[in-house]
Interface confidence: low
């Protein structure tokens, strides 16, 4: 329904904590380099230009779109050209043309410092002095950062964050309170921002009867007694709610999401046995909830797929009648059933399925020819279920940092020509997936496994995208999002690459690495062995292990030496030497 | 472009009869539930009729049971209400509605909606 201010009907939609928690991410998405201060008082000043409009809906300028309001917001900034370029040039523009215009010019990868979380003390002192401005600093810092993360699901990671500073900070020891803690929000955060931004190319580069074929998969899985009626209705309204984040339109989409928590709550007959305990908690909880909530029973009495899809005579007429609609019955008959195959397997089976009916239903005899399409399934099943068990077989052999190595090493034979920081980034999010899925129970392996390493990959194929050097990865990346990972298990070593010169400057340390947190040491010794992969990439596993427990041992002695200096000095050379006869 | 265009409206008296017609363009309704609803001036929109695309499974509010039938004929791509015994309260504009295969409980179950055509009962 149509309302006179759009503005208005948001903010009393969504309350104002919420509504400008919401302005700012937007803002922090868009204008990345932005200050907080900068945002804060931009945001201010939208939430009270919202405040005269529901006071007044036909006050002046309250009839306009968001788009237009906001952006002219930004658009007024002062220095925008020197601080973000081009996209100054988007000012010059009309909505919706303008907003399109910002959208592209979103980086995935901004040059901006890692997030630094500050000490305890530090960190209560000023959430006790300002809780709302330290939350609106979390919010900041993370969008401008993730600049796709889902917004409404960031002021849930917010919330929590906000939960544990006032359970900690209230605590004798605060530092061991917060560090555990924190740590898991912030995991699960990244892993929420790489899923989203998969469901944001998704929709980008495949529209939304993609997203809506993916929606419409994982609803089935979860939600195996809901009809196929309800799925599609589900699908269509998620599809919406992420069409709107994914396109800088927060407010509607926090809105909307609200709206279809509500809507699951209260046709849970219909929907799910298993959303009660989501249904009792607060908004930004019940949606979060609701978003992984386990799968429901699957009905005991399910027919064989084949009956309707394979035996039936009429499928070909079916089929003709109404592609998409046939199609989407499949996708959800087969999801319900199999809640252990991965999202994109799925969606790969029925991608198989559609291509059969069409080359099939042309032919003077179609059943005859779509009656083995189920036995063709068989290797698209098989191939991921292979990938799991050997990844998760040398992940349980190895432990996380060893498999990040492990794939580090295939990753960088792949793809030599890909930027070592990109590499090493890739290698360690690929090897999180061991300590993530496979010690999960066998049936949600697969999966587990494959949907997070299908999003990991399209971060490397974003960063890819902006430089592009290699032919591997851009093969890869211009398939559909479905083949993606697939086609970067297939990939062997690179053999038009000419390996790298040794540089000794690229293999010699110095004493600083030995006060490294953990992680900063990894990577450090995780970008020397892509160097060396570099260097030399048919370089065997045995020559590469002897080379890293050298440079292990190496460290591990000069950290402990009492003259750190001299030790890294005078034994670094011996270690490049060693290294490049182990390799030689 | 998908869309539902309803027909067949007017005044009548009370105790006569009408019957609306749905018709679909830009998809067939093989594979669509359609549901006719009613909003009277000043009242929320109300479920009052609905026909499963099989044809098999049909439904209807209470107020209208024994008055009103649903139908369909797919070859015209066009679901039926016929109305009887029409009543002054059975003023209203009613709007066809096209769901996926069943037919919704709720008014937001459904995906596609026309643009409505007036009934008016009076004397």
């Known amino acids: 329904e149509a309302h006179k201010s759009e503005i208005a009907h948001r903010y009393n939609d969504l309350g104002e904590q919420h509504f400008k928690g919401l302005v700012l991410i937007a803002f922090s998405q868009y204008l990345q380099k932005c200050s907080y201060d900068e945002h804060a008082k931009l945001v201010q000043e939208v939430t009270d230009f919202a405040k005269t409009c529901v006071a007044d809906e036909s006050a002046a300028n309250c009839d306009k779109s968001l788009h237009t309001l906001f952006g002219d917001k930004l658009c007024a900034i002062p220095n925008l050209r020197e601080n973000y370029g081009e996209l100054a040039d988007c000012c010059t523009k009309q909505e919706p043309e303008r907003n399109e215009c910002f959208l592209q010019h979103k980086d995935d990868n901004p040059s901006l410092p890692p997030f630094e979380r500050p000490e305890a003390e530090a960190m209560c002192t000023s959430f006790k002095e300002n809780p709302t401005t330290f939350m609106g600093h979390y919010l900041h810092e993370v969008a401008r950062r993730h600049p796709y993360f889902y917004a409404p699901e960031l002021l849930y990671y917010a919330e929590q964050y906000n939960e544990i500073l006032t359970q900690c900070c209230a605590e004798a020891d605060k530092e061991s309170c917060l560090t555990p803690k924190l740590d898991g929000v912030k995991e699960k955060a990244l892993v929420s921002s790489v899923r989203q931004r998969m469901k944001c190319s998704s929709m980008q580069k495949f529209g939304e009867r993609a997203f809506k074929a993916w929606a419409v998969a994982r609803l089935s899985q979860t939600f195996p007694n809901a009809d196929f009626a309800e799925i599609t209705k589900l699908a269509t309204d998620l599809t919406k709610v992420n069409k709107e984040c994914c396109h800088g339109d927060l407010l509607e989409c926090a809105d909307d999401r609200a709206e279809l928590a509500k809507y699951m709550c209260e046709n849970q007959a219909t929907i799910s046995s298993k959303l009660q305990t989501c249904c009792d908690k607060p908004l930004l909880k019940k949606a979060h909830c609701l978003s992984e909530v386990e799968h429901d029973t699957m009905p005991a009495d399910l027919p064989a797929i084949a009956a309707d899809f394979v035996e039936d005579q009429e499928v070909c007429k079916n089929y003709a009648e109404a592609k998409d609609v046939f199609l989407g019955t499949f996708l959800y008959e087969y999801s319900r059933r199999h809640p252990d195959y991965s999202v994109s397997l799925l969606l790969r089976l029925a991608k198989k399925y559609e291509a059969t009916l069409e080359k099939c239903c042309a032919e003077a005899n179609p059943p005859a020819c779509y009656g083995t399409v189920l036995a063709e399934f068989q290797p698209l099943v098989e191939e991921p279920k292979n990938l799991v068990k050997t990844n998760c077989d040398l992940y349980e052999k190895l432990g996380e940092y060893g498999f990040q190595n492990a794939i580090l090493v295939r990753y960088t034979q792949k793809a030599p020509q890909v930027s070592t920081p990109t590499l090493v980034e890739a290698a360690r999010n690929l090897g999180r997936v061991g300590t993530k899925c496979c010690t999960l129970p066998e049936d949600q392996r697969l999966p587990c496994v494959e949907d997070y390493l299908s999003a990991i990959l399209n971060r490397v194929c974003l960063l890819h995208e902006k430089t592009p050097v290699s032919e591997h990865v851009t093969k890869c990346c211009s398939g559909s999002l479905v083949e993606r990972r697939p086609c970067f298990s297939a990939l062997t070593v690179d053999e038009t690459y000419v390996p790298k010169e040794f540089k000794a400057e690229t293999f010699t340390f110095h004493s600083d690495i030995c006060t490294l947190p953990e992680k900063e040491k990894q990577i450090k010794k995780q970008t020397a062995l892509a160097e060396l992969v570099k260097h030399k990439p048919k370089a065997t596993a045995e020559q590469l292990k002897t080379v890293m427990d050298d440079f292990a041992q190496f460290l591990d002695t000069c950290c402990k030496a009492a003259d750190k200096d001299t030790c890294f000095s005078t034994e670094g050379p011996n270690l490049v030497t060693r290294c490049k006869d182990a390799l030689a | 472009e998908v869309q539902l265009l309803e027909s067949g409206g007017g005044l009548v008296q009370p105790g006569g009869s009408l019957r609306l017609s749905c018709a679909a363009s830009?998809?067939?309704?093989?594979?669509?539930?359609i549901g006719w609803f009613r909003q009277a001036p000043g009242k929320e929109r109300e479920g009052v009729s609905c026909?499963?695309?099989?044809?098999?499974?049909?439904n209807y509010a209470d107020s209208v049971k024994g008055r009103f039938t649903i139908s369909r004929d797919n070859s015209k791509n066009t679901v039926y209400l016929q109305m009887n015994s029409l009543r002054a309260e059975d003023t209203a504009v009613y709007y066809c509605?096209?769901?996926?295969?069943?037919?919704?409980?709720?008014?937001?179950?459904?995906?596609?909606w026309g643009q409505g055509t007036q009934v008016t009962v009076s004397s």
């Open positions: 509605a096209a769901a996926v295969l069943e037919c919704r409980t709720v008014v937001r179950g459904y995906d596609y």
């Open positions: 830009g998809f067939t309704l093989d594979y669509y539930a």
């Open positions: 026909i499963a695309s099989s044809g098999g499974s049909t």
